[in-house]
């Protein structure tokens, strides 16, 4: 005979679950579907990931997201995790927001980002609900810098980047400082591929770095180079 009252708790149908912390009176729920829509927008050495919540929340409101990263070397096609070498704008696991920025990406590397949606019952199933997006980083190459000439009080410096990338650069920023002086530095901006740094001290080493400025922001910086002005004994404007 049917009982006069309903049961105090019901078994869940296949594919539905109660999390251990769920009260018996709570409806059965299931893991969410994958994030609905994922975009990866590259900006120099950064990528902004944005996604929309799953279309099916599984009947729960405790959805969190995890982002993982894989990088692939174009030459060999080999891939590997890149968590150790990139920086996230916030911890990439247990995210409640639907966007994150990933920075410190390497030029000419292919990245695949996976965004997984989870809720309180996701741990009770083996399947995962995720979406992936890939992006290639096309940040400008670091400029190759050369010392073209020097005098007792000046250094003439030139640089180059691959011709296909030159159209993306609107200016170059040259930063230089006296070696051993960490507190002050000078900055020169130019549209060309060379600059003469004047009013320098004789027989002194200067640290020089060149960075391309593009519409997306800063390109990769060159190496920090050490260039030395002539000593007064060897004066005259000598080409290197």
């Amino acid at each position: 005979l049917p009982s006069p009252e309903g049961a105090t708790s019901c078994e869940c149908e296949e594919g539905f679950f109660r999390a251990p912390q769920d009260p018996a009176s709570m409806p059965c729920t299931r893991p969410p579907s994958a994030p609905h829509y994922l975009t990866a927008v590259g900006m120099g050495a950064k990528v902004e990931l944005r996604w929309t919540p799953p279309q099916d929340s599984g009947g729960r409101e405790d959805i969190v997201y995890s982002v993982t990263c894989e990088q692939c070397w174009p030459e060999s096609g080999e891939c590997g995790p890149c968590e150790a070498s990139v920086r996230y704008s916030e911890p990439p696991h247990g995210l409640t927001r639907t966007s994150v920025t990933v920075s410190d990406l390497e030029p000419h590397m292919n990245y695949t980002f996976t965004v997984e949606a989870r809720n309180g019952v996701s741990g009770l199933v083996t399947s995962r609900s995720f979406r992936t997006a890939s992006v290639s980083i096309n940040q400008t190459e670091p400029p190759k810098v050369r010392l073209e000439g020097r005098s007792t009080t000046s250094l003439s410096v030139s640089w180059s980047i691959p011709p296909p990338q030159q159209s993306r650069v609107w200016k170059y920023e040259v930063t230089y400082r006296k070696k051993g002086d960490s507190n002050s530095y000078n900055v020169r901006r130019t549209e060309g591929f060379s600059v003469t740094l004047d009013d320098l001290a004789p027989d002194t080493t200067y640290l020089v770095q060149v960075q391309a400025l593009t519409q997306e922001g800063q390109g990769a910086g060159s190496k920090v180079h050490e260039f030395q002005t002539l000593s007064p004994e060897g004066s005259g404007n000598l080409a290197v």
């Epitope: 670091p142 070696k179 080493t205 640290l207 770095q209 260039f227 030395q228």
Partner: antibody, heavy 130, light 108 residues
């Protein structure tokens, strides 16, 4: 081809002064910054400091963690440079290496501080124990 | 002071490719040098200036460097490559030489 040969006392008591010498055979002694590097047993490499002798001036540069106890000097007549580390403790037990950088320090205005080390001495194991 | 971070160990099967990383703030602006050290021996320079090889070093050793990570790649790994590997840079801010903590490469 430059070669480095080093020697010095291998067993010291705490508070004594470690003393090692490295002889440079071949190459231009004054063009390079010469370094000392050490490696405690089972651990990584630690740069101790460097010296360059140009004209009559010695240019020294030391690891800040050891600076108060380290002296690196040169004897240009013998193409040798030496390391002294005072007030040693058991923590100074290590293999000590002398090393030559790949390139002369400055060539035509282009300088290479902290260059790669392409030639190393054979290493001297120094033990500090009471 | 400037810090270089290496994984303590990397394992790889013979014939495969090993990648050893060296992490440091904006390391791409620095020249990175790599050494191989076998037990009881002095270190040997295998790559300098990020990707150049000294004479006598086989082309299976290569390097790259950008952003915050430099990488030493050893292709077609063989048993003789089992050793400790160290990265090194010059820190222009302090004018000091800095070594990474070292990575033990094990060939399975």
């Amino acid at each position: 081809q430059v070669q480095l040969q080093q020697w010095g006392a291998g067993l010291l008591k705490p508070s004594e002064t470690l003393s090692l010498t490295c002889a440079v055979y071949g190459g231009s002694f004054s063009d390079y910054y010469w370094s000392w590097i050490r490696q405690p047993p089972g651990k990584g490499l630690e740069w101790i400091g460097e010296i360059n002798h140009r004209g009559s001036i010695n240019y020294n540069n030391y690891n800040p963690s050891l600076k108060s106890r380290v002296t690196i000097s040169v004897d240009t007549s013998k193409n040798q440079f030496s390391l002294k580390l005072s007030s040693v403790t058991a923590a100074d037990t290590a293999v000590y290496y002398c090393a030559k950088p790949l390139r002369p320090h400055c060539t035509n205005g282009v300088c290479y501080s902290g260059d790669a080390f392409d030639i190393w001495g054979q290493g001297t194991m120094v033990t500090v124990a009471s | 002071s400037y810090v270089l971070t290496q994984p303590p160990s990397v394992s790889v099967a013979p014939g495969q490719t090993a990648r050893i990383t060296c992490g440091g703030n904006n390391i791409g602006s620095k020249n990175v040098h790599w050494y191989q050290q076998k037990p009881g021996q002095a270190p040997v320079l295998v790559v300098y200036d990020d990707s150049d090889r000294p004479s006598g070093i086989p082309e299976q050793f290569s390097g790259s460097n950008s952003g915050n990570t430099a990488t030493l790649t050893i292709s077609r790994v063989e048993a003789g490559d089992e050793a400790d590997y160290y990265c090194q840079v010059w820190d222009s801010s302090s004018d000091h030489v800095v070594f990474g903590g070292g990575t033990k490469l094990t060939v399975l």
